[in-house]
Interface confidence: low
């Protein structure tokens, strides 16, 4: 048994500058820190627990956030945080610091809470040695730390499994001999494989099982005959009729997660370690209070006895423990080639030109769904789009009441009437055309097109408001 | 998604040895679960044969574990099965499967087919 | 060894109909410490690998219609499907998963009526 134990030094933006945090605080904060410690070098599946157990900071000292201003080093929660470990310190772990930070707004339900950064760290260290220090980059931020893993009597050693006791409490009892040289103490002897028979067998190695004279067996619980073998129960060699050792129930240690196996009559038990229970060690017992569920998860206990716990993840995190990010834009949620960007706590679409909405999937260069009011049509070029107004009408959706003689069309002092399919000029003396834009030479012969049989300079001119050049 | 792919020589002679490795994809061999090996004979009911733990701790159906070695390759990320002294008896469709820790299995093999002949 | 002995050895039942297979072992599966009965149920179809339908006696995999569910608790178990569907059509095997050995029942054949 001993503790873990975690020294946060500072916690600020790294040399690159302030980070800009997607979650833009506003009123005043204060920083928590959330410990998690796993077995092994290994790559530890995202969403495992804690194994080796997870501790939480109390609460910093209150600071305001200034946007503008580069952010300093924050002000950090006092103390340690410690982790205790019932069992041997494994040596190799994996060290997941958070850094979370708590506003505390009149958000409706609290405060709320945001994760700064995650470093992941894999480390090997014995128990009892001094502090380690580390320098870890999560983003633009910085963490500081150092830490250390000690035993607590009477465990001593690297991984905290020699049981020792002071001499000058008590000399060294039955089963107990003198420490290493120099240490004022007494150790058990080695740990003997799991279920081993304490009044037949022995080890001098750990992990042994030697049985004494008249036993035998993996773990020296099968009596051994002298005499004939004959009349003994159990099962015997076609060969010589004497009891052979049958197939132990904790042959292959049927024990899970780290659990040890003891024979009893007709099966076995396994201790299990901490974290797990079951038959076999099989069922995950970490519960709420050991801080299992990552980056906000809600934890509530599970209502089935295996699942000791749920977590209820907050959006973009996935998991048993809330440990994997959602990769949301792997989704690719953005259309017409919008770039993705998971801010965290929401998604955004940058568009590409030509192209908007929350997912950019409004082409604005598109009259599909492109409404011009008032019979106005939608006419596509040049990268956009623009609606050709019904006569009467006019702006860019064609919702503007418009006067078509307003921009007096017909030249050389013509009268402009408005029709309903367009305008009409009536062109003064001399004058003709659809905009009486032609003058009329005094021998009768226009300077360009004749005006048509039947139509008299000085007759008003019909022009439909939707054709540039229309002549009769 | 985790998958298992058996593969081994399809045709084993009476007294030989039957090998089979079991491929592991989309899951480690050194993760919280045991590895199996079940076989079904022609038109008949499944039987299991044992299980080995990435540790190399395995357990044995008692009936076969005279015949029976399973171990596991880390390195490979593959488990195997070695049944010596085979008989026409040991004719099967041999799976191999993942045991979650408590013992379902919850993912299998495709399975193959062992026939022993001479 | 724990046998398994399931009945009936085959079931024709109508489509939509209830269908439902017993279990017995011949030695409690329940683990007191965590009162968990340590038995499984699988589906397999001609062809196929079996297919894990329900753990811990009653627990349906992931995946698994709702049709199907598993009961019983000791030495009695059951699986019942509550509307046969046409896919269903199946051998089903119970397995107890308890101990160090592992055992499944012969299997039952669900065909439709």
């Known amino acids: 048994a001993g503790v873990f134990e975690l020294q946060i030094h500072s916690f600020g933006p790294g040399p690159g500058g302030a980070p800009r945090s997607p979650y833009s605080a506003r009123g005043p904060c204060r920083l928590f820190f959330r410990v998690c410690l796993k077995p092994g070098l290994s790559e530890e599946a995202a969403e495992s627990p804690c194994a080796l157990g997870a501790a939480l900071s109390a609460r910093g000292p209150v600071y305001t956030e200034q946007p503008e201003a580069p952010a300093p080093d924050l002000p950090l929660p006092n103390g340690l945080l410690q982790v205790p470990f019932r069992d041997a310190w494994p040596g190799t772990f994996s060290l997941i610091i958070e850094t979370w930070r708590e506003e505390l707004g009149d958000q409706i339900g609290g405060p709320a809470w945001s994760l700064l950064a995650r470093v992941t760290r894999r480390r090997r260290l014995a128990a009892g040695g001094p502090w380690a220090g580390d320098i870890q980059r999560a983003g633009a931020w910085e963490l500081r730390f150092s830490y250390r893993a000690r035993c607590e009597l009477p465990a001593v050693g690297t991984a905290c499994t020699r049981l020792c006791r002071p001499r000058s409490a008590s000399r060294c009892g039955p089963g107990l001999r003198p420490c290493a040289p120099l240490e004022d103490e007494c150790e058990a002897p080695p740990v003997c494989r799991a279920g081993c028979s304490l009044e037949h067998g022995f080890c001098e190695q750990p992990g042994e099982c030697r049985c004494l004279e008249g036993w035998t067996g993996p773990l020296c619980m099968v009596p051994v005959s002298t005499s004939s073998c004959l009349g003994l129960r159990g099962p015997s060699s076609t060969t010589t009729g004497c009891l052979v050792p049958g197939p132990g129930p904790c042959d292959g240690n049927p024990c899970a997660n780290g659990g040890s196996c003891s024979e009893t009559p007709g099966s076995f038990e396994c201790t299990c370690p901490r974290g797990f229970y079951g038959l076999r060690c099989e069922v995950s017992g970490v519960t709420c209070a050991d801080g299992p569920c990552f980056n906000g998860g809600l934890c509530v206990g599970g209502a089935d006895p295996d699942s000791a716990y749920i977590c209820h993840c907050p959006p973009g995190f996935q998991g048993s423990n809330c440990e994997k990010r959602v990769d949301r834009c792997s989704l690719q949620p953005c259309r017409n080639g919008g770039l993705c960007l998971d801010l965290g706590h929401a998604l955004r679409c940058r568009c590409r030109a030509g192209f908007a909405g929350p997912r950019c999937e409004h082409d604005l260069n598109d009259c599909a769904g492109r409404a011009c009011a008032n019979g106005g049509t939608c006419v596509e070029g040049g990268g956009a789009h623009r609606c050709s107004c019904a006569l009467g009408f006019g702006g860019r959706d064609c919702r503007e009441r418009a006067d078509p003689c307003a921009a007096r069309p017909c030249a050389h002092g013509g009268r402009c009437y408005a029709h309903f399919s367009g305008l009409v000029c009536a062109c003064a003396p001399g004058y003709m055309g659809a905009r009486c834009e032609f003058p009329v030479h005094p021998d009768g012969v226009s300077a360009l097109p004749a005006a048509p049989p039947g139509l008299r300079p000085g007759d008003p001119q019909r022009y439909p408001h939707h054709h540039h050049h229309h002549h009769h | 998604q985790v998958q298992l792919q058996e593969s081994g020589p399809g045709l084993v002679k009476p007294s030989g040895t039957l090998s089979l490795t079991c491929v592991v994809f989309?899951?480690?061999?050194?993760?919280?679960?045991?590895w199996s090996w079940v076989r079904q004979p022609p038109g008949k009911g499944l039987e299991w044969i044992g299980e080995v733990f990435h540790s190399g701790s395995t357990n044995y159906n008692p009936s076969l574990k005279s015949r029976v070695t399973i171990s596991v390759d880390k390195s490979k990320n593959q488990f195997s099965l070695k049944l010596s002294s085979v008989t026409a008896a040991d004719t099967a469709v041999y799976y191999c499967?993942?045991?979650?820790?408590?013992?379902?299995?919850?993912?299998w093999g495709q399975g193959t087919l062992v026939t022993v002949s001479s | 060894d724990i046998v398994m002995t399931q009945s009936p050895d085959s079931l024709a039942v109508s489509l939509g109909e209830r269908a439902t297979i017993n279990c017995k072992s011949s030695?409690?599966?329940?683990?007191?410490?965590?009162?968990?009965?340590?038995l499984a149920w699988y589906q397999q179809k001609p062809g196929q690998p079996p297919n894990l339908l329900v753990y811990?006696?009653?627990t349906r995999e992931s995946g698994v219609p709702d049709r199907f569910s598993g009961a019983g608790s000791g030495t009695d178990f059951t699986l019942t499907i509550s509307s046969l569907q046409a896919e269903d059509v199946a051998v089903y095997y119970c397995q107890q998963y308890y101990g160090t050995s592992w055992t499944f029942g012969q299997g039952t054949k669900v065909e439709i009526k």
């Open positions: 030695q409690s599966v329940l683990y007191s410490s965590n009162n968990k009965n340590y």
């Open positions: 499967a993942r045991a979650a820790v408590a013992g379902a299995l919850d993912y």
């Open positions: 811990w006696a009653s």
């Open positions: 989309g899951d480690s061999i050194s993760s919280s679960n045991w």
